[in-house]
Structures are given as C-alpha cells and as structure tokens.
Amino acid sequence: ERLPLTPVSLKVSTNSTRQSLHLQWTVHNLPYHQELKMVFQIQISRIETSNVIWVGNYSTTVKWNQVLHWSWESELPLECATHFVRIKSLVDDAKFPEPNFWSNWSSWEEVSVQDSTGQDILFVFPKDKLVEEGTNVTICYVSRNIQNNVSCYLEGKQIHGEQLDPHVTAFNLNSVPFIRNKGTNIYCEASQGNVSEGMKGIVLFVSKVLEEPKDFSCETEDFKTLHCTWDPGTDTALGWSKQPSQSYTLFESFSGEKKLCTHKNWCNWQITQDSQETYNFTLIAENYLRKRSVNILFNLTHRVYLMNPFSVNFENVNATNAIMTWKVHSIRNNFTYLCQIELHGEGKMMQYNVSIKVNGEYFLSELEPATEYMARVRCADASHFWKWSEWSGQNFTTLEAAPSEAPDVWRIVSLEPGNHTVTLFWKPLSKLHANGKILFYNVVVENLDKPSSSELHSIPAPANSTKLILDRCSYQICVIANNSVGASPASVIVISADPENKEVEEERIAGTEGGFSLSWKPQPGDVIGYVVDWCDHTQDVLGDFQWKNVGPNTTSTVISTDAFRPGVRYDFRIYGLSTKRIACLLEKKTGYSQELAPSDNPHVLVDTLTSHSFTLSWKDYSTESQPGFIQGYHVYLKSKARQCHPRFEKAVLSDGSECCKYKIDNPEEKALIVDNLKPESFYEFFITPFTSAGEGPSATFTKVTTPDEHSSM
C-alpha cells in the first residue's frame, strides 16, 4: 500500500496590487526520478476557516523534489480580511490504475495583509486601483471602532455594502464606468454622533478600454523609409501619472525587427537595402491593462505614395494653347509614373491622364483667351497604383485675342428740327467674346447718301452709349469693340432719312410677376429680326433703357427681369429690322408688371356752389404718373339725409360709417355736379381714384354747406 502523497511546506505570499495569493508547496514521498500526474484541491476561507469562499482543483505533473506554484486572485482586497489556505492531493496517473484516494489536508495557512495597523480608526481598500471600464470591483472599509457609524460615498452618492464582520464592510461596484481621467472618487467617513472620527478617500482609476488601432497602413515615397499611420482611437491616459497614454510598437516578422513608436498615430520604419520586398507588420497597442494588435502584409512596390511633383511651369502660352511641364522625384530606375492633370478655368474642370518616365509635359489646347487657369498635377506608380501624390499646381493666364463677336447695338432716334438725334447703346461683350480687356469702341458713321463721307468716333471703355446728331440723310453706323490685340466684327445699324416714328397706337398690356408677355403682327416683307426695347415710362429714357433681339420667325417674346418693379409703368416698342438693317416701329405697348392702388388723391376744387348744387373738379390730377392705370374715380358723399341722391348708392366706409358712393368710369372725366341738394344743409365729400389694385389712400372728408335760397340767387 502506497503512502498518501500529502502536500507539505505550504507557503503563501501576497501581491496587494494584484490582490493575489501565491501558493508554494512540495510533495513528500514521491519516488525518486519519477513523474506523476496529480490533482491538488485547494480551499480558501475568509475571516475564519469555516467560511470557505473558494474551492478548486489544480492538475499538473509532479517531479521529485519539485516546488509547485499556483496563484489565485481575490475580488476582495486582501487588506480587507484575513484569508486561510489549505491543500490536499490525489494521484491521477495511468501508472497507478488501482483506486486512488485523497491525501489529508495540509494545515491551514493564515494570510493577513496588515495595512490597517496605522493610527487611523478607519481604513479603505484598495487605496489606488487601476481597472478597465466595465469591470466589477469590490472595495471595503475596516473600522477599528465598531461603535462608529461609517458612511461611504461614490462620487458624492452614498453606497451600501455587505458587512463581512463587525469591523469590515464590502461594496460591490458592478461594471464601473469611466468618469474622468483623474479617477472615480470614493470616500468613507466615520463618525460618532455629529463628531467626525476620520475621513478617508481613495481613487478608483477607471481606464477606457484600449481600442484596436484602426486604418493601419504603410507606404513609401522613396524606397528608403516606410511611413506607417493608424487611427489610435481613444487615449487611455489617466491623471495623477497613474497610466500614461498607450504605447505603440511596430514588429516586422520577416526581419524580426521591432520599433517602439514615439508618436501616437504614426511611425517611420527604415528600409534596409537587402531587397526585402514583402513586409508583415504587427502594430501593437499597449497600456497597463491590455494589449491590442493589428496586422498588415504587403509588397513594398505596391505601396508607393509619391512626393508631389515640383517645378510646374507653362511654356509657349498663347491665346488658346499652353505647354505644361513638371518634374517628379526619381525614386527608382525605369520607373513609370501615371500623372493626372486637372485644369480649372471659367467654372469648368478638365482632367487628363499621362504616362511619363522622368519629366512631365502636356499640351493644353482649346483654351479660352485672356483667361486665368489653374492647372495642377499629381502622380502615382503606374505599375501598381496605390494612391495619388498630393497636388502641385500653378496659375497661368492665356494671352488676349481679338474680340470674337460684334457688340449688341441699339438706338433711340428722336426727330428735331432739321436733324436726327441718335442715341446709340451697346452692351459690353461677355468675357467669352471679349477675349481680353476692351479698351475702346470705334463708332463709324457713314452717310449713305454721300458715300465718300464717314466719321470715326473713338469712345473709351467702359462707356456703353454715345449721342450722334445727324442731318436728315440715311446713315449706316458701325460699332466695333477693340482690345489690345484687335477689333471685333462690326455691328451695323442703319438710320433712314424717313421719319420712322410714324403714329402707332399704344396698347395697354398687363404684366405678371414673371414679366411681360408680348406679341406682335409680323412685318410685311423680309425681316432679319425684331427688336423689343423698353424703359420706365416716367423716367429719362437713358436711365434704364433696355432691348432684346428676337429672331425673324418669332412674333412673341417674354421680357422677364428682376428690374421690373411693382407700381412702375414700362413702355415697350417693337421694331422690325429689314434686310437693309433699317428699323421700322411696328407696335407700342405700355403696362405694369404689377399694378398698385393710387398713391395719392386728387386736389378737388368746389365750384358754383348754390343752394341746391355744387360742382367738384380735379382737372390738375395727372393719371400718367400713377402706380397703375387709373380706371376712374369714387366720389363719397355724406349728408343728414336718409336716402342717397340719384346716381349715388349706399356704401360702408372702412371705419364702419355709412355714406353714399358714386362711381366715375372714365379716368379723364375729372368733374362732377352734385345736385338735388337742400339749402342750408351740411355735406361732406371725398374723391379717390382707383386702379385694378384698389382705391387711393383714405383721407378726411371735405365739408360743404349749401347757402340759403336767398343768398344763392
């Protein structure tokens, strides 16, 4: 019968920071030079031996004379209570198939971490623990005096625990959150009555969970250095120097090299010239609580991120073409670069790709004259595209070219005794057609009746009109825009000797918010187009004169512009242009984009006052300068009489009072005889014009008293 192999020489040490017990023991009576598989059962008690809090088995192979080790971590700080440990063993080896039995228990080993031997009457543990967010933590207080009332607070809120013995209370904090990097404050206060016997604060340092680095990537710009970058995620540094920011280490498995990175989100790795092409990097993030790693495997030639091109220049720049040149940093022999050019100008963007070896060149064509362009270039490895370099760019401006289009020209002709006054207008050329800065306009006036006679007027830009006084001959007028390079095509109009403003009836039209819709009868005979011009009816023609060209096959158009204002009357004239470029006035139209109610009331005179009648007149009232077409007038009359006079009807005013109202439908009828009145009677009247938008402003009534019959005779 074999001797039971009882564990002996059990020694228990502690690690307060890790809250762990470390057991060491040996097994007696083990055969010399023999190995046995054994199972050890370990019991741990707290406060007293009968209070077993943990039982577990530990299986291992035991050699002769071997010292065995085993550790256990306590959720309760070891300073909170005395612990007891004992151990027994069982042979569990195929070499001994007969029934095995447990040895006797070793004697209890008492473990007491005496950190509550100071002079205080209250101790709180652990003093200074570091855990990860979401961990469960147990804390405790040890009170010397059981008569004391002890209250504990976590971040100012009282917490309640479980009494382990009269002196010790433990608190279980579940899934502790991160509150601040200076830790979570916990304190306990012992008091008797209202007298503080002592206060003790501890800090539970809760670290954010270390994240796996994201977007880990490495690349080279010169085959000398690999530049690796990553997103480190949350910084897990804690205050009071408890935990620094996480560290980052690069490990390359093929070379076995390792490098501690000095930056939190990038690291440079020197490429050795031993033609290593494939790299297998592990990036390890580490803080006091855990490690996280991420891996990338790549071929060096597939990770080329070029330095941006340099020496971007433009050669042979003219009005429509330029040659763009640039240089790239040479990184290897026979390296082919793919370069992308972006050309920005006039609100457009063009993109071109080109393959190059050392120096880049690209012919930029179909450019606009006198235009500033921004051209930029970026390059990449053409063989194994990884990513584009940064852009390198430069601005350049194409040269001017002669203006490409004739100015848009129109005129106003007014007849004066013995001559024509022609006011000539032109619109500035668009940038697209000016091809540079317009410096001046040449106006050539040629008398068609005397062909040899012509005059040149040079008008500096930016003027856009000129006045010509011509006799009663026919004239051809050419307008040419000039820049530093040359002249535009001529714009030609002809002023005929015949008076052109023959009487044409003016037609009233109603505009809309969108503008004016105009239509006209086609001009008999050949026309090369129509011109509609317009201006504010009440202002000097030159102030806001506008025109629009319309094609020969069109007899309607919509004039829409933000310049049309409500309550303003606009006059339109429609001309037909003959093949000889002579304008013929076809129609006149006038109207408001939006009519408004009259802005003022007429000044009314009372005439011929008799005992039975009086006359009202407002001859001076102008219907022209109103914010709408005056359609007529409303005459309001108040008197003591119950009934309204003939032709008047009952009306209610805005203030609710009653009166009599007479409507005049003719805007030019500016007088009214009010008769059938009583002598010595009191009357009040008020006259207001109206448009389609309503009446004029309300005003006070004017008082009239009829005389007695005697005095009126």
Epitope: G118, Q119, D120, F123, K127, D128, Y153, E155, G156, R180, N181, K182, G183, N185, Y187, G198, M199, K200, G201, I202, V203, G239, W240, S241, K242
Partner: antibody
C-alpha cells in the same frame, strides 16, 4: 489626536534656499496625499504643491515650478518642501495640510503654519 | 491670478441666507469636485464642504454646496454672527495641473 507641525521657516535673502518640514502624528501618514499651501499677509490662500500617498503623483503651482521640490518620507511621517531661488513674492505663512484621500480631494487637517520672509 | 473667481464680499443680517458664487472653467470646476474652506482671522483654514456638496461631520447643515457646469456656490442659511469669516472655493485644474483656490469672499454679519 491628528496633528501637523510645520518648521523651518525664517528670514532669508532673495536667491537663497530654505527647507520646510512638516511632522505628522495621530493618523496613518501613508494613507493620505499631503499639500503645502501659503498665505501672503492680507492675501488669499495659494496652493503651492501636493504629493500623493505613494509619491507617484506630484504637482506644483506655476509660480514655484522649477524652484520648489516637495517630498515625503512615509517611514518618518514627514513632509518636506525644498525652496530654492527664493523671491520677495514667496513671503507668506506656509501651511502643511493633510488631504482626505490618497490623491487630491481636499484638505481636512491643517497645521498652524510657519512664516517665510524673503527680504534683502 | 486665481483661476476661480469669487465676489470680494457678501453680507446679511442674522437669520438671513447668504450665497457665495465661485466661477471657473471647464478645466477646473467643469471637470473636478469643488471644495469650500472657512478661515477665521488668525487660525488655519477649515474644510467646510468637499466633493461639491458633502459636509464633514460637525459642520452645521446651515452650510450647503452645489455645482452646475463651470460654477459652484456655497449657501449659508440662518446666518449667525460666528459665520463671519473668509470663505474660499477650490478645485483641481487639469490644464494648470494644479489645485486652485478662489479669490476669497469676506462674509460680514450686519
């Protein structure tokens, strides 16, 4: 009885040094952070320096950084403040204070102070 | 230059309530617990309130502390003549890496 007794103050010329000591008794010294706080005549309180229970964390006011050094000897229940390159504006009553906790919570026990006068 | 600002003085008649404000920033009051100290002429200061609103045993419940955002306040209700003293707020400042006191408020009982 919890007690803090400061010593080492005195009259000193500008540019010279002084070492303040604080003897602690009546409590478990190594369970608490400790501080030095000063008060110039007729002025408010100014925190000078603090040291955590195990000296793992030390802090200084900007006005003394690089000139003053705080230290503690837990075996001797003592706190020290080494003051170098003293200036006239360092003239004050220097208090030694015990914290509630292992780091910087708040000061629940104060000594009576020791006077430092810096003058030529 | 203190990082925490207090009114220089406050006063009230016996029985009245007096409130002292303490204004800081996100790096001090905004991120750290606030303490209040009472100092009579002569002796050393005394801890009155810690952790924003906690009264150590022995401090009358007439004293109460509160904190909101980057400001804190100390209220003394039922003012008594022996409350006449200087009061200081204080908090750890993360950007200065220092414990900062307020400018101090002298409370007078009229």
């Amino acid at each position: 009885q919890v007690e803090l007794v400061e010593s080492g103050g005195g009259l000193v010329q500008p540019g010279r040094s002084l070492r303040l000591s604080c003897a602690a008794s009546g409590f478990t010294f190594d369970d608490y952070a400790m501080h030095w706080v000063r008060q110039a005549p007729g002025k408010g309180l100014e925190w000078v320096s603090g040291i955590s229970w195990n000296s793992g964390s030390i802090g200084y006011a900007d006005s003394v950084k690089g000139r003053f050094t705080i230290s503690r000897d837990n075996a001797k229940n003592s706190l020290y403040l080494q003051m170098n390159s003293l200036r006239a504006e360092d003239t004050a009553l220097y208090y030694c204070a015990k914290d509630i906790g292992v780091y910087y919570y708040g000061m629940d026990v104060w000594g009576q102070g020791t006077t430092v006068s810096v003058s030529s | 230059q203190s990082a925490l600002t207090q009114p220089p003085s406050a006063s009230g008649t016996p029985g009245q309530k007096v409130t002292i404000s303490c204004s800081g920033s996100s790096s001090n009051i905004g991120s750290s617990p606030v303490n209040w100290y009472q100092q009579f002429p002569g002796p050393a200061p005394k801890l009155l309130i810690h952790s924003n609103n906690q009264r150590p045993s022995g401090v009358p419940d007439r004293f109460s502390g509160s904190k909101s955002g980057t400001s804190a306040s100390l209220a003394i209700s039922g003012l008594q003549s022996d409350d006449e003293a200087d009061y200081y707020c204080a908090a750890w400042d993360d950007s200065l890496n220092a414990y900062v006191f307020g400018t101090g408020t002298k409370v007078t009982v009229l």
